[in-house]
Interface confidence: low
């Protein structure tokens, strides 16, 4: 299916609006520090060029690959060397090395100021004055902060962002209408970004076999009535889509995602009874809906798996003939029967089954050797079940903030070398698992919790890869994708760690503390907690609780005082001295 001009092909397939949006996202994800106006100029130039190619596919340069065209355009940025340093060296390379070079320089933690939300009236004026620029700015700001955001999904977020302003800027109480919608988009956006980052890490660090295994398990849970052949086709197509998006091929990715949505809606009967309501929606909404669709009901009376995968005398013959297909079928059959298991658990079971067959099919009596393979699954299943049970009990007992604090202490003791902002961010997000998953019925808790934790721990791995400081973190992040969470869970207090020297400056607070939002206050307190644990890794829960309670009381007292700053200046050193004494 070759085209004389790839850029013309994609422009015609996607339409001008989506084409321009995706090119803006691509450029913003590559050159994260460039000003908005610079990117808009580049996008307009690319769009005008694409239109000449639509008019005449034989026109000069229209036959060039998208990587060549986009890379050439990025390399025209005048300030590339000053702004990006060694990334400018990418421009000396030829494709495909140049694109690989750009990909390697994507920054998961760019040094960009946090987005400040202006007053509602200011935003509504900007929206009405120039809707197109307003929405482009949204794409640009999100994309540069989230360089792996799933591009076609970001277009869907932008459409919802536009709809929120269109509705709420006409409302009687604009703020009451708009702010909850913006909060929801922000939270969903962060979650979407983190989920996609795991997909890209899976593909880039562990290869497409790892991603395909994940997809087989997840799609088999979602579509338990679908044939293995059908699931395999969906997995192949989905892998192509995500490989493209993670590789910066955003036009191809969006085009292929649209094709996949079309295929699924045309073949609902052989996929799932749950797709109907998605398939009536417009493209962006439809694709989102299909990705989030609930699990279909499991077929009645599925026979036991043991017959084909344990009792059969042909297991080793079947395994030897087509290892990946046989293991894929095992994973499919197991996953469709277990919507109550996390995908990561299912992948561990498939890994354990594979290891058993590797060992047993070389043994004198293979059947005797693998006869008890399903019994070996029990401890693998019980470990996450127990973990979820214990942590949900703790969450229910403590509430979210204190549960986050317990995790902060736990993870700081495990990996105290990791930077304090990273430990605070990751532990706060780990703590959100409680509110997200513990309220769910038993059968949904494990898939919710463990697969969410995998996403959060991937963030730790991604940040740590940029600035590696802990061999333990490197080991857990790189040895096995499916065992990352159990690896981190198994880490104990790092006995080799030399405690951080006490720094009074770290525990010095000012009156500005009183004007912070509740969330910002929590982050300040949690930052202090991490620093305390780094100073005294062997401090007991009781000691830390005592210090944190004193801290809360000290802040509350000073924020009620008439002269807040004087109170902080006077009470702060007392708090520090008392804390040191309590932890001595």
């Amino acid at each position: 299916d070759t085209h004389k001009s790839e850029v013309a092909h994609r422009f015609k397939d996607l339409g001008e609006e989506h084409f321009k949006g995706l090119v803006l996202v691509a450029f913003s994800q590559y050159l994260q520090q460039c000003p908005f106006e610079e990117h808009v100029k580049l996008v307009n130039e690319v769009t005008e060029f694409a239109k000449t190619c639509v008019a005449d596919e034989s026109a000069e340069n229209c036959d060039k690959s998208l990587h060549t065209l986009f890379g050439d355009k990025l390399c025209t940025v005048a300030t590339l060397r000053e702004t990006y340093g060694e990334m400018a060296d990418c421009c000396a390379k030829q494709e495909p090395e140049r694109n690989e070079c750009f990909l390697q320089h994507k920054d998961d933690n760019p040094n960009l100021p946090p987005l400040v939300r202006p007053e509602v009236d200011v935003m509504c004026t900007a929206f009405h004055d120039n809707e197109a620029t307003f929405l482009k700015k949204y794409l640009y700001e999100v994309a540069r902060r989230h360089p792996y955001f799933y591009a076609p999904e970001l277009l869907f977020f932008a459409a919802r962002y536009k709809a929120a302003f269109a509705e709420c800027c006409q409302a009687a109480d604009k703020a009451a209408c708009l702010l909850p919608k913006l909060d929801e988009l922000r939270d969903e956006g962060k979650a979407s970004s983190a989920k996609q980052r795991l997909k890209c890490a899976s593909l880039q660090k562990f290869g497409d076999r790892a991603f395909k295994a994940w997809a087989v398990a997840r799609l088999s849970q979602k579509f338990p009535k679908a044939e293995f052949a059908e699931v395999s086709k969906l997995v192949t197509d989905l892998t192509k889509v995500h490989t493209e998006c993670c590789h910066g091929d955003l036009l191809e990715c969006a085009d292929d995602r649209a094709d996949l949505a079309k295929y699924m809606c045309e073949n609902q009967d052989s996929i799932s009874s749950k797709l109907k309501e998605c398939c009536d929606k417009p493209l962006l909404e439809k694709s989102h809906c299909l990705a989030e669709v609930e699990n279909d009901e499991m077929p009645a009376d599925l026979p036991s798996l043991a017959a084909d995968y344990v009792e059969s005398k042909d297991v080793c013959k079947n395994y030897a003939e087509a290892k990946d297909v046989f293991l894929g079928m095992f994973l499919y059959e197991y996953a469709r029967r277990h919507p109550d298991y996390s995908v990561m658990l299912l992948l561990r079971l498939a890994k354990a089954y594979e290891a058993t067959l590797e060992k047993c099919c070389a043994a004198a009596d293979p059947h005797e050797c693998y006869a008890k393979v399903f019994d070996e699954f029990q401890p693998l299943v019980e470990e996450p079940q127990n973990l979820v049970k214990q942590n949900c009990e703790l969450f229910e007992q403590l509430g979210e903030y204190k549960f986050q604090n317990a995790l902060l202490v736990r993870y700081t003791k495990k990996v105290p070398q990791v930077s304090t902002p990273t430990l605070v961010e990751v532990s706060r997000n780990l703590g959100k698992v409680g509110a997200k998953c513990c309220k769910l019925p038993e059968a949904k808790r494990m898939p919710c919790a463990e697969d969410y934790l995998s996403v959060v721990l991937n963030r730790l791995c991604v940040l740590h890869e940029k600035t590696p400081v802990s061999e333990k973190v490197t080991k857990c992040c790189t040895e096995s994708l499916v065992n990352r969470r159990p690896c981190f869970s198994a880490l104990e207090l790092d006995e080799a760690y030399v405690p951080k020297a006490f720094n009074a400056e770290t525990f010095t607070f000012h009156a500005d503390m009183c004007t912070l939002s509740e969330k910002e206050k929590q982050v300040k307190k949690q930052t202090a907690l991490v620093e305390l644990v780094k100073h005294k890794p062997k401090a007991t829960k009781e000691q830390l609780k005592g210090v944190m309670d004193n801290f809360a009381a000290f802040v509350e007292k000073c924020c009620k005082a008439d002269d807040k700053e004087a109170c902080f200046a006077e009470e702060g050193p007392k708090f520090v001295a008392a804390s040191q004494a309590a932890l001595a």
Partner: nanobody
Framework: EVQLVESGGGLVQPGGSLRLSCAAS????????MSWVRQAPGKGPEWVSA????????RYAESIKGRFTISRDNAKKTLYLQMNSLKPEDTAVYYC????????GSQGTQVTVSS
Amino acid sequence: EVQLVESGGGLVQPGGSLRLSCAASGFTFGSFGMSWVRQAPGKGPEWVSAIDSGGTDTRYAESIKGRFTISRDNAKKTLYLQMNSLKPEDTAVYYCTIGQSTSRGSQGTQVTVSS
């Protein structure tokens, strides 16, 4: 591309017999267990019978035990269902599937039992 093509269905009187065939292509037929599934008008799919890859282990739904026999010929890449003592309630479209799926991955073959 995986393809499964069923044949052998038709109209038969109660107590009669039929033999369904399923020709497979596009995958290593001999490596996979196979099943027969049926879907009666207005009802959901119902698993009927399964056979392991080597043809040694067979399983049947309670409703057809003793009347239907599943078999396979790996050399011919074909799955069979011998149906004896047919009853009106066996009327359905019959599908063959890879593994133990109860979804319709193929066109199926219509079996109608009526006097």
